[in-house]
Amino acid sequence: SYSMEHFRWGKPVGKKRRPVKVYPNGAEDESAEAFPLEF
């Protein structure tokens, strides 16, 4: 699920995807929910 581009000599360019944080108790100034597990 990550997007990584490479120049021909293999140097990685760009950033991998950054999931948006979930704030399940949005009505509080809170810490973000831990990212869901990758499968």
């Epitope: 699920s1 581009e5 995807r17 979930v22 100034d29």
Partner: antibody
Framework: EVQLVESGGGLVQPGGSLRLSCAAS????????MIWVRQAPGKGLESIGI???????YYASSAKGRFTISRDNSKNTLYLQMNSLRAEDTAVYYC???????WGQGTLVTVSS | DIQMTQSPSTLSASVGDRVTITCQAS??????LAWYQQKPGKAPKLLIY???TLASGVPSRFSGSGSGTEFTLTISSLQPDDFATYYC??????????????FGGGTKVEIK
Amino acid sequence: EVQLVESGGGLVQPGGSLRLSCAASGFTVSKYDMIWVRQAPGKGLESIGIIYDDGDTYYASSAKGRFTISRDNSKNTLYLQMNSLRAEDTAVYYCVKGVSNIWGQGTLVTVSS
Amino acid sequence: DIQMTQSPSTLSASVGDRVTITCQASQSISNYLAWYQQKPGKAPKLLIYSASTLASGVPSRFSGSGSGTEFTLTISSLQPDDFATYYCQSYEGSSSSSYGVGFGGGTKVEIK
């Protein structure tokens, strides 16, 4: 109380510009991922762009090159600068705290001559 | 951009019915999938995140499943308050080459 209040919508001519504001209370905008979402009349939700907590911004294809998301930490406010507006940009614009129930009430932008 | 395809676009059902809405992502998004409910003139309400985790205060008749590209929202026994429009949302996030925060087209659940 945690809330988001959008402002700055209105009638603008095609090709014009508008800056929307999203004032946050009850939390610090710069500590959270924030998304702009719009909804054309009678249509579905469309994500426009995101500003991550570290300030990085990314845009949907429909917004890239025309729209810019920024924030003013001293005012605890998020902005959406919209340029080269088209009729199809007519919508209610919402700011959203990440994935959550914290949405603004929306502000209507009408692009028409 | 990630494309989210929802089906059906409209669903006619009766109180007590079991309702299933599907959402397909154009590429794998792991389980970074949320479901929202929206009623006319209101902002959307978060129902489910991480594909299957119920948001606070959401009735247990709502459930979500799936991972990768195929996801499902199920309402086990439709209640009068459930007639609304439902949206799936990918929040896998973005990279320099692709925007990964997208909504499905919506499913309107109406009274049969």
